[in-house]
């Protein structure tokens, strides 16, 4: 807490400019008008303030807006955003995607901080759902964002937003998350033709049920083992040798390399040895 002191004569700041970097902390507190600071926030980023000076500026804004900053100020916080606590951010009402982008840019290249996580949470809750533009923005900054959400949070993703998802955005998703995302993807891509559909749905197949895998096996999709290994074990187990052979096409030879790993191992153990022998891979059930 900076002690309240009168501003020395001639030191009152008429605007936010570089001369303020020579002000001591108490002078900033006494001589910079909070309302002026709020209207000229966009200038703060261009001035090389010290961390201590930024603390003073934040304190002034906190006093001016005890209920939380307005979006006009938030949008221009720049590096001052790094000084905010999750508690500060919970008071905000951020509705503009441009504001969100501006703040994410400040944290770019770093891990998702608690501040950023709180900001995103506030933004998404304010919108009511994770729409395509938001998802596009978030995954561009944080490819692992989608997989950081709980299944409950993912349930608010509308099928239309699935078009914004890239395969790498799903890399760290677990089966419970894919269980939620797969039906949405199936709905989103339902009007595509066979081969195009498979390209789009492939990354989501970790949530596919047996009947959908059986249907895919009839479509000459040639699923690779990287995709097959990400399928749900309980969805793979009921598939016959013939169905797996059709599903994998030329990649069926890859079963040998994965014979000890799930779900291949469990599937092999469910098959008759005579059926496995038809593959000519030396698989032992």
């Amino acid at each position: 807490e900076v002690e309240k002191t009168a501003c020395p004569s001639g030191k009152k700041a008429p605007e936010i400019d570089e001369s303020l970097i020579f002000y001591k902390k108490w002078e900033l507190e006494a001589c910079v008008d909070a309302a002026l600071l709020a209207t000229q926030m966009d200038r703060v980023n261009a001035i090389p303030f010290t961390y201590e000076q930024l603390d003073v500026l934040k304190h002034k804004l906190d006093e001016l807006y005890p209920q939380g900053y307005p979006e006009s100020v938030i949008q221009h916080l720049g590096y001052l955003f790094l000084k905010m606590s999750p508690e500060d951010i919970r008071k905000w009402n951020v509705t503009s995607l441009e504001t969100l982008k501006a703040l994410l840019e400040v944290n770019k290249g770093h891990e998702m901080s608690p501040q950023v996580a709180t900001l995103i949470d506030r933004f998404v809750k304010g919108r009511g759902q994770l729409d395509k533009d938001t998802l596009d923005t978030l995954t561009a900054f944080y490819p692992g964002y989608l997989c950081s959400l709980s299944p409950e949070e993912l349930s608010s993703v509308p099928p239309s937003s699935i078009w914004a998802v890239r395969p790498q955005d799903l890399d760290t998703c677990d089966p419970r998350q894919l269980d939620v995302l797969y039906p949405k993807a199936r709905l989103a891509f339902q009007n595509m033709n066979g081969s195009e559909y498979f390209v789009k749905i492939q990354s989501f197949l970790g949530g596919a049920p047996t009947e959908d895998l059986k249907a895919l096996s009839q479509q000459n999709v040639s699923m690779d083992l990287a995709t097959f290994m990400k399928l749900r074990t309980d969805a793979v187990l009921p598939l016959t040798v013939a169905e797996v052979q059709k599903l994998l096409g030329p990649h069926v030879e890859g079963l040998k390399a994965e014979e000890r790993h799930r779900p291949v191992r469990d599937w092999i153990l469910r098959q008759r040895q005579d059926d496995l022998d038809t593959l000519g891979l030396g698989l032992q059930g």
Epitope: A226, M229, R262
Partner: antibody, heavy 119, light 108 residues
Amino acid sequence: DVQLQQSGPELVEPGASVRIPCKAAGHTFTDYNVDWVKQSHGQSLEWIGDVNPNTDGAIYNQKFEGKATLTVDTSSSTAYMELRSLTSEDTAVYFCARRRLGQGGFDSWGQGTTLTVSS
Amino acid sequence: QVVLTQSPAIMSASPGEKVTLTCGASSSLISKYLYWYQQKPGSSPKLWIYSTSNLASGVPARFSGSGSGTSYSLTISSMEAEDAASYFCHQWSSYPYTFGGGTKVEIK
């Protein structure tokens, strides 16, 4: 450019444990198993086991069961091998290597971590 | 486990000479599960030949591989200085995966 980056040499006392990281870059981590191979005094190679990054399921050469534990952290695209109850017999170079799911053979290797067990 | 025996353990060859390395398996393998690696001192092994006879990317055409059942070989049709290295055969036909003891090829 595919890379498997291992940590530098380790000098460890008998009876201790060591954890060797193998950080992957340049490929989709979950599309490859990570295998570990031991090479004693520049001679033969021994397969220790492999780990699947999707299930974190590891398969071991029986000889190394209880000696090695293989794990992955998909969030950092890093595989780990922990070796415990170390003896002089564990002195060797340890390599991680990637193997594309559904394929045999190791198409990219780490530079190796030299482990010396000595008091 | 499948034991792979390589011979000779060490050999010397003159530039231009034909070199043949052998790898014998203690039990029959499916040939597509037999691979070869090259390793130079201080370096990691490199995939050299896969599925008995296919050259890995970047491997010179003077190398070839053949074999079936329990008997496999790697041949260098005309030895060059850069081929001096150790060569290991490797099987993944059955667990545990195993490697041969290696053949060290030196240049005369």
